[in-house]
């Protein structure tokens, strides 16, 4: 189709080489009239459509994304050619940063319902550059945490080194929906609820004498509980003796509950005590069996191919540790009688 009638938007993604970050493009076609995907009169670049991204039909995935090759080849369907780019409804997600993402991206409705819809498309010229500015050492992260129940804030990474006074007007989106009131480079949240978790996008306009473009950054916001003040507790084994049959295989499970920690480095291991000797046993990898907002339960098993007489003289010790401290639980094997 002819893309010369598409409205054009220029975007800049300046990514940090130090961190993983994502990027999104919205198919920001204007809010349609009832039977059309687009208003006939296009919005001027300064106007913000009332609802972003495009909500032109009941099926929000009713848009098609293409990339325009720089060599003038025909448009390429994004889904077929670019595995690191995912279409989610009307949003295009770039999972990895890199200058190779630079280019022209076009979106338009899949279903052309009227002659007016033929030119109903948006062309986004995306320029991707690594961040070179070392002066802003402490720019906000693209992954930010909000502490549940307390006051928090979300900062726009590309503007976090500027004071509020010199910061340009910012347009914020949460999960693709325009946050109409927010215009500053930092969103303050009175009281954090899990509802505040999500993908936030901040846009501002930068201009030179020739043209203007939108600088965009994406922030993944996670809502968390405060770090635990407790060391982990062992849920299993509870008893310090275990009846076993000699010559039979045996699996002893150690299950421990670890409270939430922002920097989480749980330790769960088995070791054996035999008179004065002590050694760690190489056992299968630990696995998380339950994870909630507040805590995580991790399990690690010790497997004996067959229980020997010598095993009855040993103590099998499960050792668990977090940044607060450690806990142990020892198990003595006892031969089953009768």
């Amino acid at each position: 189709f002819n893309i010369s009638g598409c409205s054009t938007k220029k975007l800049l993604w300046t990514y940090s080489t130090r961190s993983e970050e994502e990027f999104v493009l919205f198919c920001d076609l204007p809010e349609p009239q009832k039977s059309h995907f687009c208003h006939r009169n296009r919005l001027s670049p300064k106007q913000v459509p009332e609802h972003l991204p495009f909500m032109g039909s009941n099926d929000l995935s009713d848009v098609q994304w293409y990339q325009q090759p720089s060599n003038g080849d025909p448009l390429e369907d994004i889904r077929k050619s670019y595995p690191h780019i995912i279409q989610d409804k009307c949003t295009l997600h770039f999972l990895t940063p890199g200058v190779n993402n630079s280019g022209s991206y076009i979106c338009r409705p899949k279903m052309i319902k009227s002659p007016y819809d033929v030119a109903c498309c948006v062309k986004m010229i995306l320029e991707v550059k690594p961040q070179t500015n070392a002066s802003c050492e402490y720019s906000a992260s693209h992954k930010q945490d909000l502490l549940l129940g307390s006051t928090g804030s979300i900062s726009c990474p590309s503007l976090s080194c500027q004071s509020d006074a010199q910061s340009p007007a910012v347009t914020w989106y949460k999960n693709g929906k325009l946050l109409s009131v927010e215009r500053s480079n930092r969103i303050v949240v009175d009281e954090v609820y899990d509802y505040h978790q999500g993908t936030y996008v901040c846009d501002y306009t930068q201009s030179d004498t020739v043209s203007s473009w939108t600088v965009r950054a994406v922030v993944q916001v996670r809502t968390i509980v405060g770090d635990t003040k407790l060391k982990p507790d062992i849920l299993d084994p509870v008893e310090d003796t275990l009846e076993v049959e000699l010559g039979k295989p045996l699996t002893i499970s150690c299950k421990a509950r670890f409270g939430f920690e922002r920097v989480f480095n749980p330790v769960i291991k088995w070791y054996i005590k035999d008179s004065d000797l002590e050694w760690e046993v190489s056992v299968p990898e630990a696995k998380s069996i339950k994870s909630t907002l507040k805590d995580e339960i991790i399990e690690r098993n010790i497997i004996l191919e067959k229980v020997t007489q010598r095993d009855l003289r040993r103590k099998f010790v499960c050792f668990v540790q977090n940044s607060i401290g450690n806990t142990t639980q020892s198990v003595q094997l006892k031969e089953k009688r009768g």
Epitope: L148, G149, S150, T151, I154, W172, K174, L179, V181, E182, I187, V188, V189, D190, E191, V192, Y193, Y195, H196
Partner: antibody, heavy 119, light 111 residues
């Protein structure tokens, strides 16, 4: 507990200020203090909320913007200023406390104060 | 603003029976929904918050369910003391907005 005061009989076009007073806790803690009204024989209608924590943010139902103003006036009082009152504003006005511990729901209500608008 | 639509407006059931009240939100409010009971001349009383969590002291005969836009309050083994008006409320405190709209109410008559 919470207690509302300031309800009165006023003429159409008049202004009135209602006060919500806390006892047993203070608005220095972080709560959403809200005003809700109920016309005789009708349902509950949310008017506005103020966050009593550091941000001091205020929020209004779209119909209440401009004519109603919620403010925290001390560590134990929140007020609701109402202007250009009409017969449609006749209602019992409740002060209510919400917040994180109840998923934003109102766990504490005042008994209400009656506002009557009549010429 | 979020709009809450509550049905039915009134319901009558015998003692020991079951009442189901529905509440629909005009947009997705996840599980940020509360249910209140109000008796004449009294302020409302919180029954359920976060769609399904019972407030302290509320009997387990009251059950809340649902998420997104569709919510239900079920009162089983009806008692005379359950005769009241019940309201749902959106309790969403978002980024830069508060959505605290109430449903229109449901009057429960216990025969």
């Amino acid at each position: 507990s919470l207690e509302e005061s300031g309800g009165d009989l006023v003429k159409p076009g008049a202004s009135l200020t209602l006060t919500c007073t806390a006892s047993g806790f203070s608005f220095s803690s972080n709560y959403y203090i809200c005003w809700v009204r109920q016309a005789p024989g009708k349902g509950l209608e949310w008017i506005a909320c103020i966050y009593t924590g550091s941000t001091g943010s205020t929020y209004y139902a779209s119909w209440a913007k401009g004519r109603f103003t919620i403010s925290k006036t001390s560590s134990t009082t929140v007020t609701l200023q109402m202007t250009s009152l009409t017969a449609a504003d006749r209602a019992t006005y409740f002060c209510a406390r919400g917040g994180y511990s109840y998923g934003g729901a109102v766990s504490l209500w005042g008994p209400g104060t009656l506002v009557t608008v009549s010429s | 603003d979020v709009v809450m639509t509550q049905t039915p407006a009134s319901v009558s059931e015998p003692v020991g029976g079951t009442v189901t009240i529905k509440c629909q939100a005009s947009e997705d409010i996840e599980t940020y929904l509360a249910w209140y009971q109000q008796k004449p001349g009294q302020p409302p009383k919180l029954l359920i918050y976060r769609a399904s969590t019972l407030a302290s002291g509320v009997p387990s005969r009251f059950k809340g369910s649902g998420s997104g836009t569709q919510f239900t309050l079920t009162i089983s083994d009806l008692e005379c003391a359950d005769a009241a008006t019940y309201y749902c409320q959106c309790t969403l405190y978002g980024v830069n907005f508060v959505a605290n709209a109430f449903g229109g109410g449901t009057e429960v008559v216990v025969k």
